[in-house]
Structure formats: C-alpha cells, structure tokens
C-alpha cells in the first residue's frame, strides 16, 4: 500500500516502523528498558493505546482505521535515558482520489456485495482493489470477483465468507499511472451488515376456533440462535377496503416459532406473511410469500 511514513525523532532513534498488513508497530529494543508505551493519535485527537507485546518492543493495534491519517508515538525509558519518537502515517496521494461511499451487505446467508464510487478527483485510469482481513488477522481475502463500471472496479462480490469473523477490516487501495491514489479503510461488523432472508416453511392450520401459524427461522451467515430473532406477522383480511389497517403482530423468537390466534368458522379469506430481524438491531428482512387461508364466502 502506498503511504509515506515520516519519522520525527531525536538524535538517537528508536527506528520505529509500522506494518499496515499486521497493524504492528515495532521499534529497536533498548537494553535495560524500565518503561515502554506506544499509542496513536488520529485526526480527531482520539488516542488509542494497545497492550505491549511480550517482548515489549512492539505493539499491535486491533481495531483502527488509517485513511484519515494517524500519528504513532513510542515512549521508552531505560535505566540511562528516555527515548521518544513519533511516526506520521499520512494517507498519501491526491486528496479526493480514494474510493468513497463504501458499503457492504451480506445476503442469502453466504454471499456478500461491497460497492464504492470512484473518488471525485481520481484520474480516468484509476483502478481500485479490495482486501479484507478478519479481526484475528490470520488471513487476507482479496476480492475474487470485481463489479466494473467502464473498466474501473466499483464493487466486489464474494461467494465464500468462510474467512470472515464477526468484525472485519476492509481496505480499498487505488493505483494510477498518473498520480498517487489515496486508500480507504473501514471496520464493519457482520451483524450490522447482514440482510436476513424472510422466514421459511410458513404454514397455517386452522380448526373451528383458531388458526396456528408456524415458521422456521431464516438461515443466516451469523451464528444466531432462536432468541436472537424477532418476527413480525402481517395478518391481512382479503378484499377489505383500501386504507384498512393491517394487523401487525410482534413475536419473539422461540425454539418452535408459532402464533395462535382466534379465528372462528366460517372465516373470510385471509393472508399471512412474516418477516424477521435481529432482536437487537431490528433490521427487517423482506416479507415472506403471502400464505392464504379461509374462503371467499366466509
């Protein structure tokens, strides 16, 4: 990734270096070290201070974005003297060339699309590349299928999400023969970007006095269990006047998803459809296909 690393240091340098692939900041170990500290300051003056690695000459930043530019700083005391060094990590390249409007969503439980737009000042020959690293940083995923607009990559389709974890780091690099292109990076939670399918296996069974609706929770990319779901049922009487209120019923997820409601014979024609959401986010899925029950002459 193209980025100028500029060191601001006193005469005897710690030789601070940063590897953006591993997010590891390291420096030359000093003999008889009594104190070490590393941190970064971002453009909004927020400070992030990770734990030092066991050897105390490096530290790893877990959840940080770098595209706005950051300054790393290392403080080391030895029994003889103190060291201090700053490392500027700017997002080099022409302002406004980075990918923008970046977003991703997971759908159908195991597919993901990411899209972005070319930067407003990016040259015509700009090309963007997407890399994804999971929170454990054990592997990097390169985009396997790019979505293109006039030859420029403006999106990515992934059909294998096995390398992702619950939180992932997305990096869009850019190249051009004309000028330096800035990068864009983002941290995304899979639970916040997943769009659920509607519930499946929706059935309605009625007796003389009640109707019982049953359904199965949707298959999801996240490992969710039954308590993580909230459902909404839309029970709708057919052939009613326009503007008549639909009955929307909220139901918490259960091991056996069911909703029993009074409906006596003869019963008019009704339809029921169901949608699902994560109970904590309420990002509703689309509605399931409507199931009809009852009769026209009810």
């Amino acid at each position: 990734e193209k980025s100028d690393l500029r060191t601001v240091a006193p005469a005897s340098s710690l030789n601070v270096r940063f590897d953006s692939r591993t997010m590891n900041l390291s420096w030359d170990c000093q003999e008889n070290t009594t104190f070490s500290k590393c941190f970064l300051t971002d453009k909004k003056n927020r400070v992030v201070e990770p734990r030092l690695s066991n050897n105390e000459c490096s530290c790893t930043f877990r959840e940080i974005c770098l595209h706005e530019g950051v300054t790393f700083e290392v403080h080391v005391n030895t029994s003889q003297r103190g060291f201090q060094q700053k490392l500027l990590y700017p997002n080099s390249g022409r302002e406004g060339t980075a990918a923008q409007n970046f977003s991703c969503f997971i759908y159908n439980a195991d597919l993901m699309n990411c899209t972005w737009a070319r930067g407003p000042t990016a040259p015509r020959d700009v090309q963007y590349f997407l890399y994804i690293r999971n929170s454990k940083r054990r592997r990097e995923i390169r985009c396997p299928y790019y979505i293109q607009d006039s030859g420029t990559h403006v999106g990515c389709h992934l059909d294998n999400l096995s390398g992702l974890t619950s939180r992932n780091y997305f990096l869009v690099n850019g190249t051009s023969r004309e000028i330096g292109i800035q990068f864009f990076d983002s941290l995304l939670d899979t639970k916040k970007i997943e769009r659920f399918n509607p519930p499946s296996n929706v059935t309605v069974r009625c007796n003389t006095t009640h109707c019982l609706v049953r359904w199965k929770q949707p298959r999801t990319y996240q490992k969710l269990s039954y308590l993580d779901f909230q459902y909404q049922l839309d029970v709708h009487r057919k052939n009613t006047q326009p503007g008549t209120e639909n009955l929307l019923i909220n139901v918490s997820g259960d091991l056996e998803n069911r909703y029993n409601f009074p409906s006596s014979e003869p019963r008019a024609k009704h339809s029921v459809k169901i949608r699902a959401a994560d109970v904590r986010i309420l990002n509703w899925s689309s509605w399931s296909e409507a199931i009809e029950f009852g009769s026209d002459d009810g």
Epitope: S166, S225, L227, D228, L255, R280
Partner: antibody, heavy 120, light 110 residues
C-alpha cells in the same frame, strides 16, 4: 415440545471417569448447540463448555481443559459430557442446556440435571 | 469468587416490587456485553428469565431487566410465593469463551 432428558445419578470413585448423556426430543440435535454447566451442592452455576460457532469447535472452560470431553451422536440426538480424573470437588449436579443466543452465551432451555457424587 | 457480584439474599412481601443487582466490570458487563438472568426454584434446573439485558422469553412476565454501565438489575413486580428461588445473572468475560455467572441471590418471600 422440545425437551432435554439427562441420564440418571452416578456415584464414582476418585480418579474414575463419568459420562453424562443428554437426549434431545422434539428437535434434531444438528439444529441446536448444547452447552454444559455444573453446580456443586449449595454453590452457584459454573460453565464447563460447549460449541462456539466463532471457533467452529467445542470449547472448554480453562479449568476443565484436558479433563472434559463433549461429544454428540446425531443419529440418536444425544449429547455427552465425559469428565475424567474425578475428585471430591467434582461432586455436583451437571446440566446440559440449549443455546438461545451466542452473543453473549445465553442458555434458553435446560435439562433436569444429573447428580454425580465422587466419594471413596 | 465470581467476577459478577450479587447480594447473597433479598426479601420482600407478597405484592411488593424487589430488585436484584449484579455488578461487574469493564471487562464484562461494561465491555459492553449483554446480561441474562436465570431463576432456579428449589431442587429444579435453572430457567431463563431475561436475555439481551431486557428481553423476556415467551411465557415470562412480571420480570424485567435493565443495564447501566458495569451493572445490571432484575426487577420482580407483584411478588408471589412461587418467586422464592435463587436468581443468577450471567454475561461474558472479555477474552474468555462461554459464560460467567454471578454468585446467586436467594429471594425470600415474607
């Protein structure tokens, strides 16, 4: 109606092993995740282990590591917990439970418990 | 010694409202991880009462949960004799798998 039915009480000698079973009815085991929790007499609840989807494997509480093995027989919808090198402090009621949520771990439905007594 | 601290006992008269506290730290409740609550009637298995801090499973009423900072609490309204039981809070400890439970609170209905 989903139910978890555990095996009967056991009395074991120190150093021996015990294997507790947990049969699921009204659901298939492959659609569920089972965890195990124990409770010593007059004491609180202690998580032992179970399936972690993030790791995609069964994970164990550190203090039981190397002594406990959790397995599943999907053909009979039965989960098992085996604890070896038993000592008197392992005397407890052992519960299996169905995970209702993974984040954080929430146990939605519990078995009736199996009393394991370790005594010489 | 549990990382979640609960009062050993609380009591209340029938019809009253009682609350049970659960105090953690920045590495569990304050991390922030959601809290769940379990009821254990004498001689029976625990039963889930509250999950995701304040959600109730179907069939549970009169019980409500809340969370603020590094603490959570369980409130029981309209206390009844059958509420006499042990109550446990639970959450996750950062860096550890599984669940951590509070030490439990014995509720006595006077």
């Amino acid at each position: 109606q989903v139910q978890l039915v555990q095996s009967g009480a056991e009395v074991k000698k120190p150093g021996a092993s015990v294997k507790v079973s947990c049969k699921v009815s009204g659901y298939t085991l492959t659609e569920l995740s089972i965890h195990w929790v124990r409770q010593a007499p007059g004491k609180g609840l202690e998580w032992m282990g179970g399936f972690d989807p993030e790791e995609n494997e069964i994970v164990y509480a550190q203090r039981f590591q190397g002594r406990v093995t959790m397995t599943e027989d999907t053909s009979t919808d039965t989960a098992y917990m085996e604890l070896s090198s038993l000592r008197s402090e392992d005397t407890a009621v052992y519960y299996c439970a169905i995970v209702g949520s993974f984040s954080p771990l929430t146990l939605g439905l519990w078995g009736q418990g199996t009393m394991v007594t370790v005594s010489s | 010694q549990s990382v979640l601290t609960q009062p050993p006992s609380v009591s209340g008269a029938p019809g009253q409202r009682v609350t049970i506290s659960c105090t953690g730290s920045g590495s569990n409740i304050g991390a922030p991880y959601d809290v769940s609550w379990y009821q254990q009637l004498p001689g029976t298995a625990p039963k889930l009462l509250i999950y995701h801090n304040n959600k109730r499973p179907s069939g549970v009423d009169r019980f409500s949960g809340s969370k603020s900072g590094t603490s959570a609490s369980l409130a029981i309204t309209g206390l009844q004799a059958e509420d006499e039981a042990d109550y446990y809070c639970a959450t996750v400890e950062a860096g550890l798998s599984g669940s951590v439970f509070g030490g439990g609170t014995k509720l006595t209905v006077l």
